[in-house]
Protein backbone atom coordinates (compact mmCIF):
# COMPACT_ATOMS: atom_id res chain seq x y z
CA UNK A 1 0.00 0.00 0.00
CA UNK A 2 1.27 3.52 -0.81
CA UNK A 3 2.48 5.47 2.20
CA UNK A 4 -0.07 8.27 1.72
CA UNK A 5 -2.86 5.68 1.93
CA UNK A 6 -1.34 4.08 5.03
CA UNK A 7 -1.30 7.42 6.82
CA UNK A 8 -4.79 8.50 5.81
CA UNK A 9 -6.05 5.11 6.97
CA UNK A 10 -4.11 5.34 10.26
CA UNK A 11 -5.39 8.86 10.88
CA UNK A 12 -8.99 7.79 10.30
CA UNK A 13 -8.55 4.79 12.59
CA UNK A 14 -6.97 7.03 15.21
CA UNK A 15 -9.91 9.44 15.24
CA UNK A 16 -12.28 6.50 15.66
CA UNK A 17 -10.19 5.09 18.53
CA UNK A 18 -10.12 8.49 20.24
CA UNK A 19 -13.91 8.78 19.94
CA UNK A 20 -14.37 5.36 21.51
CA UNK A 21 -11.85 6.11 24.26
CA UNK A 22 -13.58 9.41 25.05
CA UNK A 23 -16.87 7.54 25.51
CA UNK A 24 -15.27 4.85 27.68
CA UNK A 25 -13.42 7.35 29.85
CA UNK A 26 -16.26 9.84 30.02
CA UNK A 27 -14.14 12.53 28.41
CA UNK A 28 -15.63 15.67 26.88
CA UNK A 29 -14.32 19.08 25.80
CA UNK A 30 -14.47 20.46 29.33
CA UNK A 31 -12.82 17.47 31.00
CA UNK A 32 -9.47 18.05 32.69
CA UNK A 33 -6.68 16.12 31.06
CA UNK A 34 -5.29 15.69 27.58
CA UNK A 35 -7.48 15.00 24.55
CA UNK A 36 -6.53 12.15 22.28
CA UNK A 37 -4.66 13.29 19.21
CA UNK A 38 -3.12 12.32 15.90
CA UNK A 39 0.23 14.16 15.80
CA UNK A 40 0.76 13.41 12.09
CA UNK A 41 3.03 10.56 13.14
CA UNK A 42 1.05 8.31 15.46
CA UNK A 43 -2.07 8.06 17.61
CA UNK A 44 -2.27 9.15 21.26
CA UNK A 45 -5.20 8.14 23.42
CA UNK A 46 -6.90 10.60 25.81
CA UNK A 47 -5.24 10.73 29.22
CA UNK A 48 -5.78 12.09 32.70
CA UNK A 49 -3.35 14.58 34.23
CA UNK A 50 -0.36 12.70 35.62
CA UNK A 51 -0.80 9.82 33.20
CA UNK A 52 1.97 8.64 30.91
CA UNK A 53 0.91 7.14 27.59
CA UNK A 54 3.24 4.70 25.86
CA UNK A 55 3.05 3.74 22.20
CA UNK A 56 5.12 1.50 20.00
CA UNK A 57 6.97 2.96 17.02
CA UNK A 58 4.57 4.09 14.32
CA UNK A 59 4.09 2.77 10.80
CA UNK A 60 6.32 5.51 9.40
CA UNK A 61 9.37 3.75 10.81
CA UNK A 62 8.52 0.59 8.93
CA UNK A 63 8.94 2.74 5.83
CA UNK A 64 12.07 4.53 7.04
CA UNK A 65 13.59 1.34 8.49
CA UNK A 66 12.12 -1.63 6.62
CA UNK A 67 14.57 -4.02 8.33
CA UNK A 68 13.48 -3.06 11.86
CA UNK A 69 10.72 -5.07 13.51
CA UNK A 70 8.52 -3.36 16.11
CA UNK A 71 5.54 -4.40 18.15
CA UNK A 72 2.37 -3.40 16.33
CA UNK A 73 0.16 -2.83 19.36
CA UNK A 74 0.05 0.07 21.75
CA UNK A 75 2.00 -0.74 24.91
CA UNK A 76 -0.21 -1.73 27.84
CA UNK A 77 -1.78 0.96 29.99
CA UNK A 78 -0.80 -0.34 33.41
CA UNK A 79 2.07 1.97 34.35
CA UNK A 80 1.66 5.67 33.60
CA UNK A 81 3.10 7.25 36.71
CA UNK A 82 6.85 7.39 36.37
CA UNK A 83 8.46 9.19 33.44
CA UNK A 84 11.81 7.69 34.41
CA UNK A 85 10.55 4.12 34.06
CA UNK A 86 11.27 4.24 30.34
CA UNK A 87 14.75 3.08 29.51
CA UNK A 88 16.36 4.77 26.53
CA UNK A 89 18.01 1.47 25.68
CA UNK A 90 14.58 -0.07 25.06
CA UNK A 91 14.08 0.71 21.41
CA UNK A 92 10.58 0.94 20.01
CA UNK A 93 8.73 2.79 22.76
CA UNK A 94 7.70 6.45 22.79
CA UNK A 95 5.91 8.23 25.62
CA UNK A 96 4.05 11.45 26.28
CA UNK A 97 3.07 12.79 29.68
CA UNK A 98 -0.27 14.41 30.27
CA UNK A 99 0.29 17.48 32.43
CA UNK A 100 -1.93 20.31 33.63
CA UNK A 101 -0.63 22.29 30.66
CA UNK A 102 -1.40 19.53 28.16
CA UNK A 103 0.75 16.94 26.41
CA UNK A 104 4.52 16.88 26.73
CA UNK A 105 6.61 16.29 23.64
CA UNK A 106 7.44 12.67 22.80
CA UNK A 107 10.08 11.07 25.00
CA UNK A 108 12.39 9.97 23.61
CA UNK A 109 11.92 11.80 20.32
CA UNK A 110 10.86 9.43 17.57
CA UNK A 111 14.28 9.01 15.95
CA UNK A 112 15.93 8.14 19.24
CA UNK A 113 13.21 5.71 20.25
CA UNK A 114 12.59 4.05 16.92
CA UNK A 115 16.00 4.14 15.31
CA UNK A 116 16.93 5.88 12.13
CA UNK A 117 19.79 5.19 9.75
CA UNK A 118 20.38 8.60 8.23
CA UNK A 119 22.88 7.19 5.76
CA UNK A 120 20.64 4.34 4.63
CA UNK A 121 19.17 6.30 1.74
CA UNK A 122 20.21 9.63 0.30
CA UNK A 123 18.19 9.17 -2.89
CA UNK A 124 15.16 7.17 -1.77
CA UNK A 125 11.71 7.35 -3.27
CA UNK A 126 10.52 10.89 -2.57
CA UNK A 127 6.91 9.67 -2.35
CA UNK A 128 7.73 8.17 1.02
CA UNK A 129 8.62 11.54 2.50
CA UNK A 130 5.75 13.70 1.35
CA UNK A 131 3.11 12.29 3.63
CA UNK A 132 -0.03 14.28 4.20
Amino acid sequence: MHSDCIFKKEQAMCLEKIQRANELMGFNDSSPGCPGMWDNITCWKPAHVGEMVLVSCPELFRIFNPDQVWETETIGESDFGDSNSLDLSDMGVVSRNCTEDGWSEPFPHYFDACGFDEYESETGDQDYYYLS
Epitope: D39, N40, I41, L60, F64, S83, N84, L88, N97, T99, D101, S104, E105, P106, F107, P108, H109, Y110, F111, D112, F116, E118, S121, E122, G124, Q126, Y129, Y130, L131, S132
Partner: antibody, heavy 120, light 107 residues
Framework: QVQLVESGGGVVQPGRSLRLSCAAS????????MHWVRQAPGKGLEWVAV????????YYARSVKGRFTISRDNSKNTLYLQMNSLRAEDTALFYC?????????????WGQGTLVTVSS | EIVLTQSPATLSLSPGERATLSCRAS??????LHWYQQKPGQAPRLLIK???QSLSGIPARFSGSGSGTDFTLTISSLEPEDFAVYYC?????????FGPGTKVDIK
Amino acid sequence: QVQLVESGGGVVQPGRSLRLSCAASGFTFSRFAMHWVRQAPGKGLEWVAVISYDGNNKYYARSVKGRFTISRDNSKNTLYLQMNSLRAEDTALFYCARGYDILTGYPDYWGQGTLVTVSS
Amino acid sequence: EIVLTQSPATLSLSPGERATLSCRASQSVGRSLHWYQQKPGQAPRLLIKYASQSLSGIPARFSGSGSGTDFTLTISSLEPEDFAVYYCHQSSRLPFTFGPGTKVDIK
Protein backbone atom coordinates in the same frame (compact mmCIF):
# COMPACT_ATOMS: atom_id res chain seq x y z
CA GLN B 1 28.80 15.64 6.06
CA VAL B 2 25.86 17.72 7.24
CA GLN B 3 26.02 21.29 5.98
CA LEU B 4 23.60 24.13 6.69
CA VAL B 5 24.10 27.53 5.08
CA GLU B 6 21.90 30.45 6.08
CA SER B 7 21.33 33.52 3.91
CA GLY B 8 19.00 36.50 3.63
CA GLY B 9 20.14 38.50 6.63
CA GLY B 10 20.82 42.22 6.50
CA VAL B 11 19.80 45.61 7.84
CA VAL B 12 16.08 46.32 7.86
CA GLN B 13 13.89 49.06 9.33
CA PRO B 14 11.45 48.36 12.16
CA GLY B 15 8.07 47.19 10.87
CA ARG B 16 9.52 45.80 7.66
CA SER B 17 9.89 42.18 6.52
CA LEU B 18 12.74 39.84 5.70
CA ARG B 19 12.96 36.23 4.55
CA LEU B 20 15.80 34.00 5.66
CA SER B 21 16.81 30.83 3.84
CA CYS B 22 18.82 27.81 4.90
CA ALA B 23 20.28 25.50 2.27
CA ALA B 24 20.84 21.96 3.55
CA SER B 25 23.09 19.25 2.20
CA GLY B 26 24.81 16.05 3.33
CA PHE B 27 21.67 14.38 4.71
CA THR B 28 18.16 13.44 3.63
CA PHE B 29 16.57 16.82 4.33
CA SER B 30 13.00 15.61 3.79
CA ARG B 31 13.23 13.17 6.72
CA PHE B 32 14.25 15.66 9.42
CA ALA B 33 12.58 18.37 11.46
CA MET B 34 14.32 21.76 11.23
CA HIS B 35 14.73 24.60 13.75
CA TRP B 36 15.52 28.29 13.77
CA VAL B 37 17.42 29.56 16.82
CA ARG B 38 18.66 33.11 17.29
CA GLN B 39 21.28 34.87 19.36
CA ALA B 40 21.22 38.60 20.06
CA PRO B 41 24.67 40.23 20.09
CA GLY B 42 26.49 39.25 23.28
CA LYS B 43 23.48 37.30 24.55
CA GLY B 44 22.39 33.67 24.88
CA LEU B 45 20.52 31.35 22.55
CA GLU B 46 16.79 31.77 21.98
CA TRP B 47 14.74 29.05 20.33
CA VAL B 48 12.52 30.55 17.59
CA ALA B 49 10.62 27.86 15.68
CA VAL B 50 10.54 24.27 14.47
CA ILE B 51 8.92 22.55 11.50
CA SER B 52 8.32 18.83 11.07
CA TYR B 53 9.83 16.79 8.25
CA ASP B 54 6.76 17.23 6.02
CA GLY B 55 5.88 20.81 7.00
CA ASN B 56 2.59 19.80 8.60
CA ASN B 57 3.60 20.67 12.19
CA LYS B 58 4.95 24.14 13.00
CA TYR B 59 5.64 25.59 16.44
CA TYR B 60 6.90 29.01 17.54
CA ALA B 61 8.34 30.87 20.49
CA ARG B 62 5.87 33.27 22.08
CA SER B 63 8.05 36.25 21.17
CA VAL B 64 7.63 35.62 17.43
CA LYS B 65 4.24 33.91 17.15
CA GLY B 66 2.02 35.70 14.66
CA ARG B 67 4.94 37.60 13.12
CA PHE B 68 7.28 34.84 11.92
CA THR B 69 6.44 31.90 9.67
CA ILE B 70 8.63 28.82 9.26
CA SER B 71 8.34 26.81 6.05
CA ARG B 72 10.33 24.38 3.95
CA ASP B 73 10.68 23.19 0.37
CA ASN B 74 11.81 19.58 0.44
CA SER B 75 12.33 19.53 -3.32
CA LYS B 76 14.93 22.28 -2.91
CA ASN B 77 16.38 21.09 0.42
CA THR B 78 15.69 24.55 1.80
CA LEU B 79 14.27 25.90 5.06
CA TYR B 80 12.77 29.40 5.30
CA LEU B 81 11.86 31.94 7.97
CA GLN B 82 9.53 34.73 6.90
CA MET B 83 9.85 37.56 9.41
CA ASN B 84 7.21 40.32 9.41
CA SER B 85 6.68 43.38 11.62
CA LEU B 86 10.31 43.31 12.68
CA ARG B 87 11.35 45.01 15.92
CA ALA B 88 14.66 46.25 17.27
CA GLU B 89 14.69 43.32 19.69
CA ASP B 90 14.72 40.90 16.75
CA THR B 91 18.29 41.95 15.99
CA ALA B 92 20.27 38.73 16.20
CA LEU B 93 22.34 36.10 14.50
CA PHE B 94 19.82 33.57 13.18
CA TYR B 95 20.92 29.94 13.05
CA CYS B 96 19.15 27.13 11.27
CA ALA B 97 19.65 23.74 12.85
CA ARG B 98 18.64 20.19 12.05
CA GLY B 99 16.25 18.61 14.55
CA TYR B 100 17.11 15.01 15.28
CA ASP B 101 13.55 13.80 14.74
CA ILE B 102 10.74 13.85 12.25
CA LEU B 103 8.41 15.94 14.41
CA THR B 104 10.53 18.34 16.50
CA GLY B 105 13.62 16.90 18.19
CA TYR B 106 16.64 18.75 19.54
CA PRO B 107 19.07 20.63 17.29
CA ASP B 108 22.05 18.42 16.50
CA TYR B 109 23.77 20.22 13.60
CA TRP B 110 23.90 23.99 13.17
CA GLY B 111 24.72 26.45 10.42
CA GLN B 112 27.04 29.40 10.95
CA GLY B 113 24.17 31.89 11.08
CA THR B 114 23.01 34.97 9.21
CA LEU B 115 22.88 38.37 10.93
CA VAL B 116 19.65 40.36 11.03
CA THR B 117 19.87 43.97 12.18
CA VAL B 118 16.64 45.87 12.77
CA SER B 119 17.39 49.56 12.95
CA SER B 120 15.98 52.85 11.73
CA GLU C 1 6.83 28.12 29.15
CA ILE C 2 9.57 26.22 30.92
CA VAL C 3 12.30 28.50 32.24
CA LEU C 4 15.81 27.08 32.51
CA THR C 5 18.19 28.65 35.04
CA GLN C 6 21.91 28.00 34.82
CA SER C 7 24.46 28.51 37.56
CA PRO C 8 26.92 29.87 38.05
CA ALA C 9 26.79 32.52 35.33
CA THR C 10 30.59 32.41 35.15
CA LEU C 11 32.97 29.71 36.33
CA SER C 12 36.65 30.65 36.57
CA LEU C 13 38.90 27.61 36.64
CA SER C 14 42.34 26.44 35.58
CA PRO C 15 43.15 23.72 33.05
CA GLY C 16 43.07 20.31 34.70
CA GLU C 17 40.39 21.31 37.21
CA ARG C 18 36.92 19.80 37.40
CA ALA C 19 33.98 21.92 36.21
CA THR C 20 30.46 21.39 37.50
CA LEU C 21 27.68 23.30 35.74
CA SER C 22 24.06 23.33 36.89
CA CYS C 23 20.79 23.69 35.00
CA ARG C 24 17.44 23.92 36.79
CA ALA C 25 14.04 23.76 35.10
CA SER C 26 10.95 25.60 36.38
CA GLN C 27 8.98 22.37 35.94
CA SER C 28 9.87 18.78 35.20
CA VAL C 29 11.36 18.06 31.79
CA GLY C 30 11.93 14.37 32.53
CA ARG C 31 15.22 13.59 30.83
CA SER C 32 14.60 15.72 27.72
CA LEU C 33 17.47 18.05 28.60
CA HIS C 34 20.44 18.56 26.29
CA TRP C 35 23.78 20.38 26.64
CA TYR C 36 25.58 22.54 24.06
CA GLN C 37 29.00 24.15 23.91
CA GLN C 38 29.60 27.42 22.09
CA LYS C 39 32.96 29.02 21.43
CA PRO C 40 33.32 32.68 20.33
CA GLY C 41 32.42 33.16 16.68
CA GLN C 42 31.22 29.58 16.30
CA ALA C 43 27.87 27.81 16.15
CA PRO C 44 26.78 25.75 19.16
CA ARG C 45 27.79 22.08 19.31
CA LEU C 46 25.69 19.32 20.88
CA LEU C 47 27.57 17.68 23.75
CA ILE C 48 25.09 15.56 25.71
CA LYS C 49 21.55 14.46 24.88
CA TYR C 50 18.79 13.30 27.23
CA ALA C 51 20.59 14.53 30.34
CA SER C 52 23.29 11.87 30.33
CA GLN C 53 23.68 10.28 26.92
CA SER C 54 27.11 10.75 25.42
CA LEU C 55 27.61 11.39 21.72
CA SER C 56 30.21 10.04 19.35
CA GLY C 57 33.04 12.49 18.77
CA ILE C 58 32.56 14.17 22.15
CA PRO C 59 35.46 13.60 24.59
CA ALA C 60 34.72 11.27 27.52
CA ARG C 61 35.58 14.02 30.01
CA PHE C 62 32.11 15.50 29.33
CA SER C 63 29.30 13.83 31.27
CA GLY C 64 25.79 14.73 32.31
CA SER C 65 23.39 13.69 35.03
CA GLY C 66 20.00 14.53 36.47
CA SER C 67 16.31 14.21 35.69
CA GLY C 68 13.13 16.13 36.39
CA THR C 69 14.21 19.65 37.30
CA ASP C 70 17.88 19.42 38.30
CA PHE C 71 20.70 18.67 35.89
CA THR C 72 24.48 18.78 35.94
CA LEU C 73 27.13 18.92 33.25
CA THR C 74 30.55 17.83 34.47
CA ILE C 75 33.89 18.32 32.74
CA SER C 76 36.20 15.98 34.63
CA SER C 77 39.48 17.71 33.75
CA LEU C 78 39.41 20.96 31.80
CA GLU C 79 41.41 21.14 28.60
CA PRO C 80 42.35 24.53 27.08
CA GLU C 81 39.75 24.04 24.31
CA ASP C 82 36.94 23.58 26.87
CA PHE C 83 36.83 27.25 27.86
CA ALA C 84 33.56 28.33 26.29
CA VAL C 85 29.89 29.02 27.04
CA TYR C 86 27.63 26.06 27.87
CA TYR C 87 23.87 26.06 27.35
CA CYS C 88 21.18 23.62 28.46
CA HIS C 89 18.10 23.12 26.29
CA GLN C 90 14.78 21.42 27.00
CA SER C 91 12.77 19.62 24.34
CA SER C 92 10.11 18.32 26.71
CA ARG C 93 7.50 21.00 26.20
CA LEU C 94 6.75 23.53 23.51
CA PRO C 95 7.84 26.24 23.24
CA PHE C 96 11.35 24.83 23.58
CA THR C 97 13.77 26.91 25.61
CA PHE C 98 17.48 27.38 26.33
CA GLY C 99 19.14 28.35 29.57
CA PRO C 100 21.03 31.68 29.74
CA GLY C 101 24.39 29.90 29.62
CA THR C 102 27.39 29.39 31.88
CA LYS C 103 30.70 30.86 30.79
CA VAL C 104 33.72 28.77 31.74
CA ASP C 105 36.79 30.99 31.61
CA ILE C 106 40.43 30.68 32.56
CA LYS C 107 41.30 31.73 36.10
